[in-house]
């Protein structure tokens, strides 16, 4: 969770306690295990047609 007193991160970014700054959620594609990725919106579920062809 974000550190107390920190300004909220802008849309598309999330607070990293490890790095002590807001980080782009886009980087979770390359580094999905980063702490801040937990705060990024989960990818929408695949359409039913992809799950059950």
């Amino acid at each position: 969770e974000q550190a107390p007193g920190q300004a909220p991160c802008s849309r598309g970014s999330s607070w990293s306690a490890d790095l002590d700054k807001c980080m782009d959620c886009a980087s979770c594609r390359a580094r999905p295990h980063s702490d801040f990725c937990l705060g990024c919106a989960a990818a929408p579920p695949a359409p039913f047609r992809l799950l059950w062809p």
């Epitope: 886009a26 980087s27 594609r29 980063s34 929408p44």
Partner: antibody, heavy 119, light 111 residues
């Protein structure tokens, strides 16, 4: 503030070797991917090599043009990045930049070190 | 490898002009959520500087006259009102896959 300082450039004969170093400060070096990017005189930017993290077993990637000749490495205890360049060719003549990034976009750049390969 | 084609390769403009630089990738570098395209500025004798990442995210400290847009294969860097310090060469770069590749650059010169 973030600082990347390259060293080790110079004049070398074709077929020779050179080792570049990059000293990093001002950011959590061990958490950042690192690359070397070069720029031939009057030309554009070319990515050369990348090294990832200890948690990635220090995975490395290379441009085809340097594969088998160049080796990238890092020493997290010294906040340092290296590029061992062997079998150098005239076309390797360039300014070599050390870059640091969490992923994707190269946030941090050094001032560059010039490598000249000539007889 | 993904090829990056920048245009124009050079342009002449005056202070206050609106400047647009385009970059086309040989294949898509976007997901449904994000585009893996970045823009850099380089002044003579200096290292490149990151301006915009993920197509449209302005790097901290970069003036708001710079903006980026696009998705898929076509991307644009816009300088809304060119300032004297903006005369430089601009490069796009993708991070979709290895190898990372840069565009050939666009040199913005004084008219």
């Amino acid at each position: 503030q973030v600082e990347l300082v390259e060293s080790g450039g110079g004049l070398v004969q074709p077929g020779g070797s050179l080792r570049l170093s990059c000293a990093a400060s001002g950011f959590t070096f061990s958490s950042y991917w690192m690359s070397w990017v070069r720029q031939a005189p009057g030309k554009g930017l070319e990515w050369v090599a990348e090294i990832r993290l200890k948690s990635d077993n220090y995975a490395t990637h290379y441009a085809e043009s340097v594969k088998g000749r160049f080796t990238i490495s890092r020493d997290d205890s010294k906040n340092s990045l290296y590029l061992q360049m062997n079998s150098l060719r005239a076309e390797d003549t360039a300014v070599y930049y050390c870059t640091g990034y969490y992923a994707d976009a190269m946030d941090y750049w050094g001032q560059g070190t010039l490598v000249t390969v000539s007889s | 490898d993904i090829q990056m084609t920048q245009s124009p390769s050079s342009l002449s403009a005056s202070v206050g002009d609106r400047v647009t630089i385009t970059c086309r990738a040989s294949q898509s570098v976007s997901t449904s959520s994000y585009s893996y395209m970045h823009w850099y500025q380089q002044k003579p004798g200096k290292a490149p500087k990151l301006l915009i990442k993920y197509a449209s995210n302005l790097e901290s400290g970069v003036p708001s006259r710079f903006s980026g847009s696009g998705s898929g294969t076509d991307f644009t860097l816009t300088i809304s009102s060119l300032q004297p310090e903006d005369f430089a060469t601009y490069y796009c770069q993708h991070s979709w896959e290895i190898p990372y590749t840069f565009g050939g650059g666009t040199k913005v010169e004084i008219k």
